[in-house]
């Protein structure tokens, strides 16, 4: 059985040229994480596997940055980065779990951070 | 240049354990990942397992663990591929491959390795 | 395991014929995959990656593209020495696995 939920950053908004930090966190379950893998719409950006570290896509390797953590930080935002981002932790032995963050992208300097939020 | 240059063919006998080699040059050991990569005679490639040598950390192909380990020399740059209770359907040629850095891409391979399980 | 099916198995083809190979994931594996190129008796060789990028020195008539659980291989314009075996290969989640492999063979 699946407890464990994850947090994440939720909604959140950044500066065209800026740079943004995604993180997800999993919590309530002692399942064991052995990689996440953060998507965007229909690709790869990166993966941190436990054993092996990190693999960052070719198409973001210049805009993408390990870390913190299993977190990710996206640099040199543009108006394209707007979307959806998806962390999706693999553990053993509960299997799956998919964290959602929207990140808006703006023209100006009205960017302001969302509020956290939990999916389970 | 990235060269991987592996130990030369074995013959072993059902039961026993095989040892290959695969020594880097040419790079930053410890920057890379090592895959190792099975062919059986006139069959597909076959993933056995993947070493990163700077954290010694690995990951198995379910149907070898236990039989298989990685390790990896980072005084020597050599990585090794060490298969226990041989059988006659691990015959295969074994290849060694290297990735560099954040990247899970293989691109340098090394020339292979015949082990012939055989009594 | 994630599973790597390739279509077809073997192909017949003549220099110059556009030729399509497809592998289907078992589940979701992103824009995690790869194409292999290899010749008997030789070692594969890295073709596509991620997987519309060409590596280093290969030649524009091959092309990939896919993403989520269906992927191609392009060949534009069949070359003499292209005809060899061809695999895709999954890194998106381990264990990685490879396809069973696409023999392209001269017609």
């Known amino acids: 059985m699946m407890t464990g939920t994850i947090e994440t950053t939720g909604n959140i908004s950044a500066e065209k040229g800026g740079s943004i930090i995604l993180q997800c966190h999993l919590s309530s379950t002692t399942a064991q994480v052995t990689q996440v893998n953060w998507e965007q719409q229909d690709q790869l950006l990166a993966i941190c596997n436990a054993d092996l570290g990190w693999h960052i896509s070719p198409s973001f390797k210049d805009r993408v940055a390990p870390g913190p953590g299993l977190g990710l930080t996206l640099q040199s935002l543009t108006v394209n980065d707007t979307g959806e981002y998806f962390c999706i932790y693999h553990t053993y032995p509960d299997g799956t779990y998919t964290g959602r963050i929207f990140l808006e992208v703006l023209e100006s300097s009205v960017a302001e951070h969302g509020a956290r939020f939990q999916i389970p | 240049q990235v060269q991987l240059v592996q130990s030369g063919a074995e013959v072993k006998k059902p039961g026993a354990s095989v040892k290959v080699s695969c020594k880097a040059s040419g790079y930053a050991f410890t920057n890379y990942l090592i895959e190792w990569i099975r062919q059986a005679p006139g069959q597909g490639l076959e993933w056995m397992g993947v070493i990163n040598p700077g954290s010694g950390g690995t990951n198995y192909a379910q149907k070898l663990q236990g039989r298989v380990t990685l390790t990896a020399d980072k005084s020597t740059n050599t990585a090794y591929m060490e298969l226990r209770s041989l059988r006659s359907d691990d015959t295969a040629v074994y290849f060694c491959?290297?990735?560099?850095?954040?990247?899970?891409?293989?691109?340098?391979w090394g020339q292979g390795t015949l082990v012939t399980v055989s009594s | 395991d994630i599973q790597m099916t390739q279509s077809p198995s073997s192909l017949s083809a003549s220099v110059g014929d556009r030729v399509t190979i497809t592998c289907r994931a078992s589940q979701h594996v992103s824009t995690a995959v790869v194409w292999y190129q290899q010749k008997p008796g030789k070692a594969p060789k890295l073709l596509i990656y991620s997987p519309s990028y060409r590596y280093t020195g290969v030649p524009s008539r091959f092309s990939g593209s896919g993403s989520g659980t269906d992927f191609t291989l392009t060949i534009s314009s069949l070359q003499p020495e292209d005809f060899a075996t061809y695999y895709c290969?999954?890194?998106?989640?381990?264990?990685?696995?490879f396809g069973q492999g696409t023999k392209l063979e001269i017609k």
């Open positions: 290969h999954q890194h998106y989640s381990t264990p990685w696995t």
């Open positions: 491959a290297g990735s560099y850095g954040s990247s899970y891409t293989f691109d340098y």
